[in-house]
């Protein structure tokens, strides 16, 4: 019989280059069996992930794998930094590889990494 | 339960190339990533590269340019090809899948050993 | 690539006292750092991930702690099964181990 767990598919040291202003959702692909797990997104502070209860997520069913995603309407100056998603099954928790969120402040916009820089650093499997 | 089972020639001579194929069963390859570590005798840990569920592989850096790893998923194997095999590269070679967050090593096969020499 | 330094090379301990193994990274890894046992003739096995979360069917003797750079193995009282070589990993960026630390019995 397979082994059947949650498994969260955030590569390690993935990062995405956003704009502040802009719209964003940041995604943590998370494959399950049968009940979809518990799911939630921490934001990095220090030695801790503090978890980011008060903010807009939704669920996006694909056919292979779901999307937990974490929505930015919009994205802010200070939503720079890392995030982890993390998902309960079975009394246990298991927490993602960091996620990097550079955020470019509108006001210097002409530092915006190029569509070939980003296209170099793929920041997740599933897009 | 989870298993993992290496599988390789033994012997290579300086210069050529090793397939390795580890077999793995308990899980689908399209579920986990699995990683290519080796350990010469006596000696530590050195991570080789691993592949993704997608198919995408990570190598390390070091090595990049003589390695390769592929997977058939409907045959649950992993192949690991290393060209230009040198005295150095004598180790044993072990497959290890990743944990369900990809942040740890969880189950390990027993390895195969490799000698190279003439 | 980073570089996961480990002391001692080998440690002799007493039956029943503590083990304690480091582990420094070139550079910041937050907590993704694993430990792993090696016994004589095996290969690895996972004991802590996360940098301070026991693997299942882990003895709670077995404790990991640190985050950023440094990192520890402790083993409260050592157990005659507990003689192995132990390696940390860090899983940051691509991985790296440490050279292993040899727990002997003294």
């Known amino acids: 019989k397979e082994s059947c767990d949650v498994q969260l598919y955030i590569k390690r040291q993935s990062e995405h280059s956003i704009l502040a202003g802009d719209p964003f959702e940041l995604e943590c692909p998370v494959k399950y069996c049968a009940n979809r797990p518990h799911v939630t997104w921490c934001k990095l502070n220090g030695t801790t992930c503090v978890k980011l209860e008060d903010r807009q997520t939704s669920w996006k069913e694909e056919k292979n794998i779901s999307f937990f995603i974490l929505h930015f309407e919009p994205v802010l100056p200070n939503d720079n930094g890392s995030y982890r998603c993390s998902a309960n099954f079975q009394s246990n928790l298991i927490e993602s590889h960091s996620t990097t969120l550079y955020v470019t402040d509108v006001k210097s916009a002409s530092e915006r990494p190029s569509k070939d820089e980003m296209a170099s650093r793929p920041w997740l499997l599933y897009r | 339960q989870v298993q993992l089972k290496e599988s390789g020639p033994g012997l290579v001579a300086p210069s050529q190339s090793l397939s390795i194929t580890c077999t793995v069963s308990?899980?689908?390859?399209?579920?986990?990533?699995v990683n290519w570590v080796r350990q010469p005798p006596g000696k530590g840990l050195e991570w080789l590269g691993m592949?993704?569920?997608?198919?995408?592989?990570d190598y390390n850096s070091a090595l990049k340019s003589r390695l390769s790893i592929n997977k058939d998923n409907s045959k649950s194997q992993v192949f690991l090809k290393m060209n230009s095999l040198q005295t150095d590269d004598t180790a044993r070679y072990y497959c290890?899948?990743?944990?369900?967050?990809?942040?740890?090593?969880?189950?390990w096969g027993q390895g195969t050993s490799v000698t190279v020499s003439s | 690539s980073i570089v996961m330094t480990q002391s001692p090379d080998s440690l002799a301990v007493s039956l029943g006292e503590r083990a304690t193994i480091n582990c420094k990274a070139s550079?910041?890894?937050?907590?993704?750092v694993a430990w792993y046992q090696q016994k004589p003739g095996q290969s690895p096995k996972l004991l802590i991930y996360?940098?301070?979360n026991r693997y299942t069917g882990v003895p709670d003797r077995f404790t990991g702690s640190g985050y950023g750079t440094d990192f520890t193995l402790t083993i409260s009282s050592l157990q005659a099964e507990d003689v192995a070589v132990y390696f940390c990993?860090?899983?940051?960026?691509?991985?790296?181990f440490g050279g292993g630390t040899k727990l002997e019995i003294k």
């Open positions: 990993q860090q899983d940051y960026s691509s991985p790296t």
């Open positions: 550079q910041s890894v937050s907590n993704d």
């Open positions: 290890a899948r990743d944990r369900p967050d990809g942040r740890a090593m969880d189950y």
């Open positions: 996360y940098a301070s």
């Open positions: 308990g899980f689908s390859l399209t579920g986990y990533g």
């Open positions: 592949i993704w569920i997608d198919g995408s592989t």
